[in-house]
């Protein structure tokens, strides 16, 4: 009896895994096993492909195979008993293109109120992500065990923290890759579950702020109780994005290294320029606080955010007010390349309650306002990235008189 | 593979000064932070301190600052341990391990037995 | 300083026996605790780190968990080779520290 070739095969990558799957095209016939060969691109002749010859399964792995995954490659089939079947041959494929990016390996600490999450690739030194391994992005969903609602947190990079979560508390989650560049999503790692800590004696400080006075950079931030030494570390920001660190080298700022207030002033010339993180520690002598959340802090925007220059259209009823970029010493505009967001206070001029409005837009309606009379309005930016969380100055207060009655159009 | 080798046994007399040696291999010492621990005879372990290869940031544990002093020459992938005004109590087994984050120290090194006496 | 208490500081067992040892330290230090087996005259050898990771290479017979203050490293089932002393160690703050260790020898 002629044996039939092998139907319906499947190339499965993933990683650095390459499986082949197939049917049967013959359940009747026994003891039947199968053989491939593959071709690379622009050669005539088959080669046979080792860890996929006389195989008894459906089933085989040949990732073995040294290929460039970039390069093309070709597959054929046949079953063999006494006699062989014909070839069935694959389509061609580029394994890269074929590839599935796996899952992630993770790593969770627990905090009180915070987890950890370390992620890095579920294969180590990958051949098929050898040129992407520094785009990698994950994704994770996150849910209570015991509630199950989730929560997704997308864009994050080898070293995530969850913050603002609940003592003594069962959180699973599950983290998957992606690559952007080539438009390839992972497969979910399995479920992690983690319980936080019982609640620290001491919470960690809260609400960190830089300013800058002078020639120094002035760092602030709450606690809740008296009495405390703090100490402040820095990072460079980009090493959150180095996949192969599990080590990061948190720096002291040698004037906030056991501060008895909850501020302290350096020199500007401590960072050079750049964006880093900054976190606070408190501690009692006795007891240490967790780590702070951790603040963007970016020596450009801290030194250059200034308060926006605007100029108002004065209606009966309302103000048109447009915002342009503040000027430099020399009238110079100063271009901020960033994306900020307008907060506008105004009043009437024999009052003193304000009203506010926030815009992303640079041009801004003020309504509501009745005809002649005089207001007053100031306008401060904020940059739009909440770990940055940084704000200017208020302008200078400009006041303005409403038109009369019938000028609102 | 990662290794760290210690340099070998020492015996010093009390007041003298000592430097301990740990040298790294299959890893870039600079990625990491070296540890020291002390271990008496018969008695558990003891964090001296740390250093980190990179820029020379040490940390100390108060009974040992300003007897002990960390140093490291990254270029021959070694970290130091100097231990002055030697007294008989330290008489111990100091060993160098590696700090690798969460990893905690994940490589040790095999020893070195500093015996002190007159 | 972080202080750690271990209990029991020694143990005697049988192979096959289940053992559990505790670490308590003076302060909340999240999940950052690991735990090394100690043999005579060498050097501690790395088992788990951050409360309850088996480093590459370990049994899978032994294991970790706690958070907190509380730490346990479990050996499930006890082989000829695992009679040691076995030291927990916190990595939260400085100075680092070390519990007194657990000597677990045979019964």
């Known amino acids: 009896k002629n044996l039939k070739s092998p139907q319906k095969v499947e190339v499965d990558i993933i990683d650095d895994n390459f499986i082949l799957r197939w049917n049967r095209s013959d359940e009747s016939v026994g003891n039947v096993t199968f053989s491939f060969d593959y071709q690379k691109t622009g050669m005539d002749n088959w080669i046979k492909l080792s860890g996929c010859q006389n195989i008894t399964s459906t089933k085989c792995n040949f990732s073995s195979l040294k290929l460039n995954v970039y390069e093309e490659i070709k597959l054929r089939i046949r079953a063999e008993k006494e006699n062989t079947s014909s070839w069935y041959e694959v389509d061609s494929f580029t394994p890269f293109r074929k590839a599935q990016i796996g899952p992630p390996e993770v790593h969770l600490e627990a905090e009180d109120k915070a987890i950890v999450i370390h992620i890095s690739p579920g294969t180590k030194d990958s051949v098929m992500w050898a040129l992407d391994g520094l785009s990698f992005t994950y994704s994770l969903v996150i849910w209570k065990n015991s509630s199950g609602v989730e929560e997704r947190i997308e864009n994050i990079y080898s070293r995530h923290k969850i913050y603002k979560l609940s003592p003594e508390t069962t959180y699973c989650l599950k983290v998957k890759a992606a690559l952007l560049t080539s438009w390839k999503i992972g497969v979910y790692s399995p479920v992690h579950c983690i319980k936080t800590t019982v609640e620290n004696e001491l919470p960690p400080p809260e609400n960190i702020e830089v300013s800058v006075q002078n020639q120094n950079y002035v760092l602030k931030w709450d606690y809740t109780y008296a009495n405390m030494t703090f100490q402040v570390q820095w990072l460079h920001a980009f090493l959150k994005r180095n996949p192969g660190n599990h080590l990061y080298k948190w720096k002291q700022i040698p004037d906030c290294e056991n501060v008895k207030t909850t501020q302290c002033v350096f020199p500007q010339n401590v960072f050079q320029k750049g964006i880093y993180l900054l976190r606070v520690q408190a501690s009692d002598g006795n007891n240490t606080s967790f780590w702070s959340e951790e603040i963007k802090f970016d020596t450009e925007i801290q030194a250059f955010l200034l308060p926006p220059v605007f100029n108002i259209r004065s209606l009966s009823d309302s103000f048109h007010i447009y915002i342009g970029a503040p000027k430099q010493s020399g009238n110079t505009p100063v271009i901020q390349d960033y994306p900020l967001i307008y907060e506008i206070i105004f009043w009437e001029n024999t009052s003193n309650a304000e009203r506010k409005i926030i815009e992303k837009k640079t041009d801004v309606t003020v309504p509501n306002l009745k005809p002649l009379t005089v207001y007053c309005v100031k306008a401060r930016a904020h940059t739009m990235d909440e770990k940055l969380n940084k704000s200017s100055v208020f302008s200078d207060a400009v006041c303005e008189k409403t038109k009369p009655g019938n000028t609102s159009k | 593979q990662v290794q760290l080798v210690q340099s070998g046994a020492e015996v010093k007399k009390p007041g003298a000064s000592v430097k301990l040696s740990c040298k790294g291999s299959g890893f870039n010492i600079k990625d990491y932070y070296i540890h020291w621990v002390k271990q008496a005879p018969g008695q558990g372990l003891e964090w001296i301190g740390r250093i980190d290869p990179e820029d020379a940031e040490t940390k100390y544990a108060p009974k040992f600052q300003g007897r002990a002093t960390i140093t490291a020459d990254t270029s021959i992938s070694t970290a130091y341990l100097e231990l002055s005004r030697l007294r008989s109590d330290d008489t111990v087994v100091y060993y160098c391990?590696?700090?690798?984050?969460?990893?905690?120290?994940?490589?040790w090194g095999q020893g070195t037995l500093v015996t002190v006496s007159s | 300083d972080i202080q750690m208490t271990q209990s029991p500081s020694s143990l005697s067992t049988s192979v096959g026996d289940r053992v559990t040892v505790t670490c308590k330290t003076s302060q909340n230090v999240g999940t950052n605790v690991a735990w090394y087996q100690q043999k005579p005259g060498k050097a501690p050898k790395p088992l788990i780190y951050?409360?309850?990771y088996r480093y590459s290479g370990v049994p899978s017979r032994f294991s970790g968990s706690g958070s907190g203050t509380d730490f346990t490293l479990t050996i499930s089932s006890v082989q000829p080779e695992d009679f040691a002393t076995y030291y927990c160690?916190?990595?939260?703050?400085?100075?680092?520290?070390f519990g007194p260790g657990t000597k677990l020898d045979i019964k």
């Open positions: 951050s409360t309850s």
């Open positions: 391990g590696r700090y690798h984050g969460y990893w905690a120290l994940d490589y």
């Open positions: 160690h916190q990595y939260f703050s400085y100075p680092y520290t």
